[in-house]
C-alpha cells in the first residue's frame, strides 16, 4: 500500500501552503525506501537518495514557482510514481446567511471569507435548540444533528423543511479542503429571519367618477402557505408620475382606496409584506403598478364591485369599505405570550 | 507595496449621499473578504459593513442598515461604500481594511473623513 | 451584538514596566479576539489574532492570552513607542464588535 496519505481532493495531487515547508510524498514505493526527485520534463536532480529523507521531498518556503508536477525514481531506476503539487489556503470560516420567505422553510446560503485556491467542499448539518418552559431561560440539550440538504447538491444553499416557528437552530457550515476544516456556527430564530415575498398580482384601477381615487388590490405572495393562523399585514405606497416622494399606508386588508390621488395624474403603486404580529420583517417591494384617477362624471349606476359613494368628489369621511379579510379567530400563535425567551435574535 | 486608499470622503449636508472608494495594490484583492471600519471624532472604532470575496454575502451594522450599501470590483481592485440619507452621527473617518477571513483586519487604510453638517 | 468591555480605560506605567489590559466578551466567543494598536492620527494595526497569536512583524514583547469570555493583553516591557490606544475585538460574531479602547502612556 502506498506510503502517502489520500487527501480529500483529485488522485495524484498534494497539497502545500505558500511560504510553509511542503512533503511530497512518493506513492509507489514502500515508506522509508530512498528515491530521487526530479521536476517533470527537467534532467536536474532535485533531492538525491542520500538525502536521508527516505520516499519524501522536502520544499523549504514553497512557493507558486514549486507548484507542478514532480517524478520519483527508485534506486534502480523504476518510476515511483508522479505527484502534482497544488499550493493553497486552508479554510477560513465560512460567512452564512439564512432567511425565510414562510414560517415553515428557512434556507441557508454561504460564501468562503477568503479564497483558498483548493478544492473545496461544503458539510451543513443543523441541530433544534427547543425552550423547556415558558419561564425558563435553560434550553433542553440540542436534538439533532441532521443534514441540511444541499439543493441542488453543490450550491452554495441548504434548505430546512418544517422547521418549528418557536425553535431556535443551530446551523453548522463547514467549509473542507485538503488543508483541514473550518466551521461557522450560526444561530437562528424563524422569527427574525422572517422575510415573506413580495405580494403577487397588484392591480390598480381608477374609480369611475372619483378623480382622485385609484383602487389597489393585490393578493398574498405564493409562496405563503394556505392557512389562517400565520397571516400578512401589507404597507401600500403610491405617488403621482415624476413625484419623488411616495405616501405609505397601512391597509387592512387586500385592497386599499387611495383618495388623495392627483387628478390626471398616472400613479405608481408598489405594497409590501410582513407577518401580522411583526416578526421578521418587510418583504421587498412588489413590481410596481400604475393606474390613472378615472376623469368622466360620476356613474349613474354603482360599480359592481363595491358600494361607493356617488355624490360628487368632496373628499367623504367614510372610505369603501374593505373586502373581508382571514378570519382572526383567536389560534395558537394569537395566544402565545411572546415572552423574552422567544424573542430570540438571530445571532450572526 | 501592499496598500489601501480611501478615497471620497468630503462635508455632505444631512440627507445627503456619498461614495466612499477604496483602491487595493500590493496583493490580490478578490481572495479577502473587505471591511469598512469607522471612528467618529475622538471616539473608538466602529465595524460598518464587510463583503465576501465573491461579493455575493455582505454584513452591516444595525446603525447603517438600509441606508449603506457595500459594494466590489475585483477587476478594478476597488472596494466601495455607498452611503445614503446621512446623518450628524455618520461623521467619522472611514477605514477600509482587509481580511484574513470575516472579520480580522491585517490590513488597514490611512482613512478618509466624513463630515455630515448644515 | 456581542458587547466588548475593556479595564482600564487608561493608564500611565513607565518604561520596562509589565503592563496588562483585559477585555471581557458578554458572552462566550472561543478564541475569536484580535487585540489592535492604534496611534495618534494612524490607523489602527494588528498585534495579536485569535486571542494569543503573534502577527508576523509584531515585536515578541506583545502578547495575548484567553477563551470564551475573559482575555488578557500584556506589554512585557512597556516602550516609548508603544503609547497608544489599544482595542480589543470580537469576531465570533459575524458583526464584529470593538472594545471601547485603552489609551496607555508614559508616566
Known amino acids: 500500500s502506498s506510503p502517502c496519505p489520500q487527501a480529500w481532493g483529485p488522485p495524484g495531487v498534494q497539497y502545500g501552503q505558500p511560504g510553509r515547508s511542503v512533503k511530497l510524498c512518493c506513492p509507489g514505493v514502500t515508506a522509508g525506501d530512498p528515491v530521487s526527485w526530479f521536476r517533470d520534463g527537467e534532467p536536474k536532480l532535485l533531492q538525491g537518495p542520500d538525502s536521508g529523507l527516505g520516499h519524501e521531498l522536502v520544499l523549504a518556503q514553497a512557493d507558486s514557482t514549486d507548484e507542478g508536477t514532480y517524478i520519483c525514481q527508485t534506486l534502480d531506476g523504476a518510476l515511483g510514481g508522479t505527484v502534482t503539487l497544488q499550493l493553497g489556503y486552508p479554510p477560513a470560516r465560512p460567512v452564512v446567511s439564512c432567511q425565510a420567505a414562510d414560517y415553515e422553510n428557512f434556507s441557508c446560503t454561504w460564501s468562503p471569507s477568503q479564497i483558498s485556491g483548493l478544492p473545496t467542499r461544503y458539510l451543513t448539518s443543523y441541530r433544534k435548540k427547543t425552550v423547556l418552559g415558558a419561564d425558563s431561560q435553560r434550553r433542553s440539550p440540542s436534538t439533532g444533528p441532521w443534514p441540511c440538504p444541499q439543493d441542488p447538491l453543490g450550491a452554495a444553499r441548504c434548505v430546512v423543511h418544517g422547521a418549528e416557528f418557536w425553535s431556535q437552530y443551530r446551523i453548522n457550515v463547514t467549509e473542507v479542503n485538503p488543508l483541514g476544516a473550518s466551521t461557522r456556527l450560526l444561530d437562528v430564530s424563524l422569527q427574525s429571519i422572517l422575510r415573506p415575498d413580495p405580494p403577487q398580482g397588484l392591480r390598480v384601477e381608477s374609480v369611475p367618477g372619483y378623480p382622485r381615487r385609484l383602487r389597489a388590490s393585490w393578493t398574498y405572495p405564493a409562496s405563503w402557505p394556505c392557512q389562517p393562523h400565520f397571516l400578512l399585514k401589507f404597507r401600500l405606497q403610491y405617488r403621482p408620475a415624476q413625484h419623488p416622494a411616495w405616501s405609505t399606508v397601512e391597509p387592512a386588508g387586500l385592497e386599499e382606496v387611495i383618495t388623495d390621488a392627483v387628478a390626471g395624474l398616472p400613479h405608481a403603486v408598489r405594497v409590501s409584506a410582513r407577518d401580522f404580529l411583526d416578526a421578521g420583517t418587510w418583504s421587498t417591494w412588489s413590481p410596481e403598478a400604475w393606474g390613472t384617477p378615472s376623469t368622466g362624471t360620476i356613474p349613474k349606476e354603482i360599480p359592481a364591485w363595491g358600494q361607493l359613494h356617488t355624490q360628487p368628489e368632496v373628499e367623504p369621511q367614510v372610505d369603501s369599505p374593505a373586502p373581508p379579510r382571514p378570519s382572526l379567530q383567536p389560534h395558537p400563535r394569537l395566544l402565545d405570550h411572546r415572552d423574552s425567551v422567544e424573542q430570540v435574535a438571530v445571532l450572526a | 507595496e501592499v496598500q489601501l486608499l480611501e478615497s471620497g470622503g468630503g462635508l455632505v449636508q444631512p440627507g445627503g449621499s456619498l461614495r466612499l472608494s477604496c483602491a487595493a495594490s500590493?496583493?490580490?484583492?478578490?481572495?479577502?473578504?473587505m471591511t469598512w471600519v469607522r471612528q467618529a471624532p475622538g471616539k473608538g472604532l466602529e465595524w460598518v459593513s464587510s463583503?465576501?470575496?465573491?461579493?455575493?454575502?455582505?454584513q452591516y451594522a444595525d446603525s447603517v442598515k438600509g441606508r449603506f450599501t457595500i459594494s466590489r470590483d475585483n477587476s478594478k481592485n476597488t472596494l466601495y461604500l455607498q452611503m445614503n440619507s446621512l446623518r450628524a452621527e455618520d461623521t467619522a473617518v472611514y477605514y477600509c481594511?482587509?481580511?484574513?477571513?470575516?472579520?480580522?483586519?491585517?490590513?488597514w487604510g490611512r482613512g478618509t473623513l466624513v463630515t455630515v453638517s448644515s | 451584538d456581542i458587547q466588548m468591555t475593556q479595564s482600564p480605560s487608561s493608564l500611565s506605567a513607565s518604561v520596562g514596566d509589565r503592563v496588562t489590559i483585559t477585555c471581557q466578551a458578554s458572552?462566550?466567543?472561543?478564541?475569536?479576539l484580535n487585540w489592535y494598536q492604534q496611534k495618534p492620527g494612524k490607523a489602527p494595526k494588528l498585534l495579536i489574532y485569535?486571542?494569543?497569536n503573534l502577527q508576523t512583524g509584531v515585536p515578541s514583547r506583545f502578547s495575548g492570552s484567553g477563551s470564551g469570555t475573559d482575555f488578557t493583553f500584556t506589554i512585557s516591557s512597556l516602550q516609548p513607542e508603544d503609547i497608544a490606544t489599544y482595542y480589543c475585538?470580537?469576531?465570533?460574531?459575524?458583526?464584529?464588535?470593538f472594545g471601547p479602547g485603552t489609551k496607555v502612556d508614559i508616566k
Open positions: 481594511a482587509k481580511g484574513p477571513g470575516w472579520g480580522s483586519f491585517d490590513l
Open positions: 500590493g496583493f490580490t484583492f478578490s481572495v479577502y473578504s
Open positions: 463583503i465576501v470575496p465573491y461579493g455575493d454575502l455582505t
Open positions: 458572552q462566550d466567543i472561543n478564541n475569536y
Open positions: 485569535d486571542a494569543s
Open positions: 475585538q470580537q469576531h465570533e460574531s459575524q458583526s464584529p464588535t
